[in-house]
């Protein structure tokens, strides 16, 4: 069980010994479904400075290079934890608080809704 | 500027208020990189829940339903902020962890290095 | 840290049979494939076979096409390299390691190898 509020160490121990995080950064740019990355900055927040991926077509690029529309550029999103200052501009309470980002796109095969 | 330890209140807020968290739920079976998720779980830590996806395949789902190798299934990663037990099993001290998650995979045009 | 130890090599004749095999441990958990890489003397290490721990999908460079067969088992966590038809040309140090980005891991991207089986295809 988690308490209510607890002290929380802001000096991060990074886990990814074992991996280069910079790994798919050229990925946005390669996929079927590629997308733009934007800056998403809030100084009341931490981390301050997120991420946002959007999918740069509705369709898919085919083989020849052209955005086919039988397939869709679909975001991948995930609910990620976030500190909030609270009270706004407090020095050293926080909140946490979840918020859903899109890390990337994928290419899918659309839900085809039939009109009468 | 962050100081090195502050409060934290774990009464969640949630800001997706406008969005459906599900809504991508069936993407992992309809993209055209399909990818399985596996529950990673770890009681020290906050979020203890962590969902992983591994791509199904090394290539990608063409239009026939088949693998097509001329293209790879990648993991699109994100670094998170998750809460670390600090010291262990310790009530209410906490130390902020970053952690690289896979969050779902994309389908990219190959770098070709080593395979003949 | 992955753990990677490779077995069964050895000396053996052109157009015969070995069968290596390599036990990983310390996975990641975005791991989902795992290669078979080799080198020969005086060469780049290069990619021989690829598969998905999840599909056992398999992937292998033209050269082997058609003589090496890659199998995985998921429980032990361990791949193997079924090589036969093998050929002079064959013979080098194989190594197996993690693919966490399948087919587009790149050789510059790993930290560790194992120690690797020697192959040696005597003509």
């Known amino acids: 069980n988690f308490p209510r509020t607890v002290m929380v160490n802001l000096n991060i121990h990074n886990r990814n010994t074992n991996t280069n995080p910079k790994r798919s950064s050229d990925y946005y740019d390669r996929s079927t479904s590629p997308w733009n990355l934007h800056r998403n900055e809030d100084p009341e927040r931490y981390p301050s400075v997120i991420w946002e991926a959007k999918c740069r077509h509705l369709g898919c690029i085919n083989a020849d290079g052209n955005v086919d529309y039988h397939m869709n550029s679909v975001p991948i999103q995930q609910e990620i934890l976030v500190l909030r200052r609270e009270p706004p501009h407090s020095p050293n309470s926080f909140r946490l608080e979840k918020i859903l980002v899109s890390v990337g796109c994928t290419c899918v095969t659309p839900i085809v809704h039939h009109v009468a | 500027n962050f100081p090195r330890t502050v409060m934290v209140n774990l009464n969640i807020h949630n800001r997706n208020t406008n969005t459906n968290p599900k809504r991508s739920s069936d993407y992992y079976d309809r993209s055209t990189s399909p990818w399985n998720l596996h529950r990673n779980e770890d009681p020290e830590r906050y979020p203890s829940v962590i969902w992983e996806a591994k791509c199904r395949h090394l290539g990608c789902i063409n239009a026939d339903g088949n693998v097509d190798y001329h293209m790879n299934s990648v993991p699109i990663q994100q670094e998170i902020l998750v809460l670390r037990r600090e010291p262990p099993h310790s009530p209410n001290s906490f130390r902020l962890e970053k952690i690289l998650v896979s969050v779902g995979c994309t389908c990219v045009t190959p770098i070709v290095h080593h395979v003949a | 840290q992955v753990q990677l130890v490779e077995s069964g090599g050895g000396l053996v004749q052109a157009g015969g049979s070995l069968r290596l095999s390599c036990a990983a441990s310390g996975l990641t958990a975005s791991s989902y494939a795992m290669g078979w890489f080799r080198q020969a003397p005086g060469k780049e290490r290069e990619f021989v076979a690829a598969i998905s721990w999840i599909s056992g999908g398999t992937k292998y460079a033209d050269s082997v096409k058609g003589r090496f067969t890659m199998s995985r088992d998921n429980a032990k966590k361990q791949v193997y390299l079924e090589m036969n038809s093998l050929k002079p040309e064959d013979t080098a140090v194989y190594y197996c390691?993690?693919?966490?980005?399948?087919?587009?891991?790149?050789?510059?991207?790993?930290?560790?190898w194992g120690q690797g089986t020697q192959v040696t295809v005597s003509s």
């Open positions: 390691n993690d693919m966490p980005y399948g087919l587009d891991t790149r050789m510059d991207e790993y930290a560790y």
